[in-house]
């Protein structure tokens, strides 16, 4: 054993910030730290083979299967992948070890597989073998947790039945609104199922897996805040558990809370309280009002009392499926170039969407923002001024909502210019969609003034690019402007642009531009 | 350098519950099929096996401890976390953390390759 | 679950000596078995593994056989370094289990 080389396997994960597929040596992409594999030698295999880990990586993952042998001298390899070979060019690092790798940029399902690397140093022939595979994420589910009382206790239980199964994490925080936000000082994470201190203004639960994570917050009335100018409402689907807690603070312990639905008490068994005294000795009370599966006749109007409170109430809302509501109708924005602007989506939904906003393909992360109507917010910002067609794609379990929206820049047109044999073209991307017109500048007309009116063609947002418009005019030639100079120029509202095109014969032509305020 | 590092309270009063976490370097819960086992050994006796947890998130247990463990983990920490309920003074060991490699198309192991340096936890009132 | 019993539990030898443990599983266990070696205050680290398999690193003085329920490890010639205790392990079924270890101490 101690005359065989010392083998070490590795994974290296890129983060992909190209769009370039193959297998490479040299790629543009930013390296997480080198995962080891423990490599193991296969015991009774005919000659030396080495086996590493298996690995899993995601569809689209850019990876490299790198090994580092500690033997002496110099090394030779070869890659085999599905029998086919592949080339191998062993270096050697710092510490003097040969370093061979193998780079997997874009995974797809036809790079999966076997991946063998045979080395032969001056001591020894040995075999190296990676199982590649991609993940399969289609069995992963990642559900919104739910609350359960625990058994004879005072305690909520906080469940997500997701695949992997999830870490659960309690996010409790103390003071009012904003300061309530995730990053935020004030709050608190606890990494655990059950939950014991329930008398906090803000209480969620989150679970977090491969897919991502989903929270639900403790619906609360505060007896001792303002009422809201709007009846917080509350969603549920048939079959989901409710839980709806009433808080109030007193100067001593001579108050009671009471829920009523519908102008009737709970019955028992549907509620719990608990009681404690904050530090500056005023007595806190809770009452959680609970149904461990609703059903259509839960709706209505829960109302939490107190002796020494005004009431307050919440309307519940059963439904049998989830919705999104929100206008779907396409909207249309005209901003100057460095004005600031966000779109936005105003939206109800149950259950929480999940949401993107995408411009030329790509995808941006969305977030939403929760109003004091029941109706949540979205904005998109991050545009830079690009104009287009902007989508806004938003689904939950049960719907899914898209709306479109077209951002026009107002600007000043720019020109490009190309011509052939036959004719002329002009080409511009100004907003609002520019009029053009041609010149032909000869003897007679040094300064170019003198207008063409035939052979002009126009169309208008000939190619539409991700929403963009771009508007051209043709000018066919004649004899009569054949080996002159002609200018194009492209007007809005807010310019002139020209472009000067020497019409001689074809191939490159020189062109002039001209800006003209 | 693969590193597993235990950490979790020194001292645990009766009846309490022991939460231990693992905390892993230079290797991967995610991308490798990697497992985790979590093994103890009270002063001057042997090795015992307490449970695992394989890369498909999939969990197996002592036969005799079942009832008290859960193992859990956390690929984005890297991070595997052992619970053991009703703790008594028999539990007093050194608790250890162990990667068990899955080769081939991640069905078989040779067992743990690389362990933890371990946890001493004691269980007294 | 499946028993693994070690022996002897303790032995003494000199520097130089051949030494023999030897550990049998209640149930046929194929070749999913390893040796560790521990050393006072300090983590197991593997010796063997699939019942003959030397781990990187290991001195060839280390050497496994066996298969299926009888299995040994033989260290050739003891050096002083090798005075510890060593764990069998079956890892062919859960729960995993251990023998009960042999203590190898300087005569």
């Known amino acids: 054993n101690q005359d065989l080389p010392v083998i070490k396997c590795v994974l290296i994960n890129h983060k992909n910030n190209d769009s370039s597929v193959g297998k490479s040596s040299s790629y543009p992409m930013v390296s997480e730290s080198p995962e080891d594999l423990g490599c193991a030698l296969r015991p009774q295999s005919s000659g030396t083979v080495y086996e590493a880990a298996a690995v899993e990586v995601d569809v689209s993952a850019s990876i490299t299967l790198q090994v580092l042998v500690d033997a002496p001298g110099n090394i030779s390899c070869l890659w085999v992948f599905k029998h086919s070979s592949l080339n191998c060019q062993p270096h050697f690092d710092l510490q003097n070890r040969g370093v061979v790798s193998m780079v997997i940029l874009k995974m797809t399902e036809t790079q999966a597989g076997e991946y063998l690397l045979f080395i032969q140093s001056e001591a020894t022939n040995y075999t190296i073998l990676f199982t590649v595979s991609i993940r399969n994420t289609l069995l992963y589910t990642l559900r919104r947790p739910y609350f359960r009382k625990m058994e004879n206790q005072d305690a909520l239980v906080c469940i997500s039945e997701s695949v992997p199964e999830p870490i659960v994490e309690w996010v409790l925080c103390d003071s009012q609104g904003e300061s309530c936000k995730e990053e935020s000082p004030a709050v608190v994470k606890k990494e655990e199922k059950v939950l014991h201190e329930l008398f906090g203004t803000d209480i969620r639960c989150c679970a977090r897996n491969e897919l991502g994570r989903e929270c639900t917050r403790l619906f609360t009335i505060d007896l001792n805040q303002t009422p809201q100018t709007t009846l917080p409402q509350l969603f549920l689907k048939v079959g989901e558990p409710l839980w709806i807690r009433c808080k109030a603070v007193h100067v001593n312990h001579g108050f009671g809370l009471t829920w009523e639905l519908e102008n009737k008490a709970l019955e028992e068994g549907n509620y719990f309280e608990m009681s404690t005294y904050s530090t500056n000795r005023t007595m806190i009370r809770i009452l959680f009002a609970f149904v461990s599966s609703v059903a259509r006749n839960d709706t209505g109007y829960y109302t939490c009392s107190s002796s020494k409170h005004p009431s307050q109430s919440a309307l519940v809302t059963i439904v049998e499926k989830g919705f999104i509501n929100a206008t779907n109708s396409s909207e249309d924005y005209e901003i100057d170039q460095y004005e600031e602007f966000c779109f936005s989506v105003r939206f109800k939904a149950y259950p929480q969407i999940r949401c993107t906003w995408t411009f030329s393909r790509k995808s941006f992360p969305c977030e939403q923002k929760g109003l004091d109507n029941g109706y949540s917010i979205s904005k998109f910002c991050n545009h830079k001024h690009q104009p287009g067609e902007y989508i806004f794609h938003a689904e939950n379990d049960d719907a899914q909502f898209t709306k479109m929206f077209t951002l026009n820049i107002r600007r000043k047109p720019q020109v490009l210019a190309e011509a052939s044999a036959s004719q002329a073209s002009c080409f511009s991307d100004g907003y609002p969609l520019p009029s053009w017109t041609w010149k032909k500048c000869s003897d007679k007309s040094p300064n170019c003034t003198e207008e063409i009116t035939e052979g002009v063609w126009n169309r208008k947002a000939n190619r539409k690019v991700f929403g963009q418009w771009v508007s051209s005019s043709t000018l066919n030639m004649s004899e009569a402007i054949k080996g002159f100079l002609v200018k194009c120029c492209a007007y809005n509202s807010l310019g002139t642009s020209c472009e000067t095109i020497l019409l001689n014969s074809p191939g490159p032509f020189p062109f002039i531009q001209d800006n003209i305020s | 350098q693969v590193t597993l590092k235990e950490s979790g309270p020194v001292l645990v009063k009766p009846t309490e519950t022991l939460t231990l976490t693992c905390t892993v370097s230079g290797f991967s819960l995610r991308n490798a099929r990697m497992g985790v086992s979590w093994i103890r050994q009270p002063p001057g006796k042997a090795l015992e096996w307490l449970a695992h947890i394989f890369s498909n998130d999939e969990k197996t247990y002592s036969t005799s401890l079942k009832s008290r463990l859960t193992i859990s983990r956390d690929t984005s920490k890297g991070q595997v976390v052992l619970t053991m309920t009703k703790m008594d003074p028999v539990d007093t060991a050194t608790y250890y953390c162990?990667?068990?490699?899955?080769?081939?198309?991640?069905?078989?192991?040779?067992?743990?390759?690389?362990w933890g340096q371990g946890t001493t936890v004691t269980v007294s009132s | 679950d499946i028993q693994m019993t070690q022996s002897p539990s303790s032995l003494s030898a000199s520097v130089g000596d051949r030494v023999t443990i030897t550990c049998r599983a209640s149930?046929?266990?194929?070749?999913?078995f390893g040796w560790y070696q521990q050393k006072p205050g300090k983590a197991p680290q593997r010796l063997l593994y699939a019942a003959s398999t030397l781990q990187s690193g290991v001195p060839s003085r280390f050497s496994g056989s066996g298969s299926g329920t009888e299995f040994t490890l033989t260290i050739s010639s003891l050096q002083p370094e090798d005075f510890a205790t060593y764990y069998c392990?079956?890892?062919?079924?859960?729960?995993?289990?251990f023998g009960q270890g042999t203590k190898v101490e300087i005569k």
């Open positions: 162990a990667r068990i490699p899955y080769y081939g198309s991640g069905s078989h192991n040779y067992g743990m390759d690389v």
């Open positions: 149930q046929d266990i194929r070749n999913d």
């Open positions: 392990l079956q890892y062919n079924t859960y729960p995993w289990t």
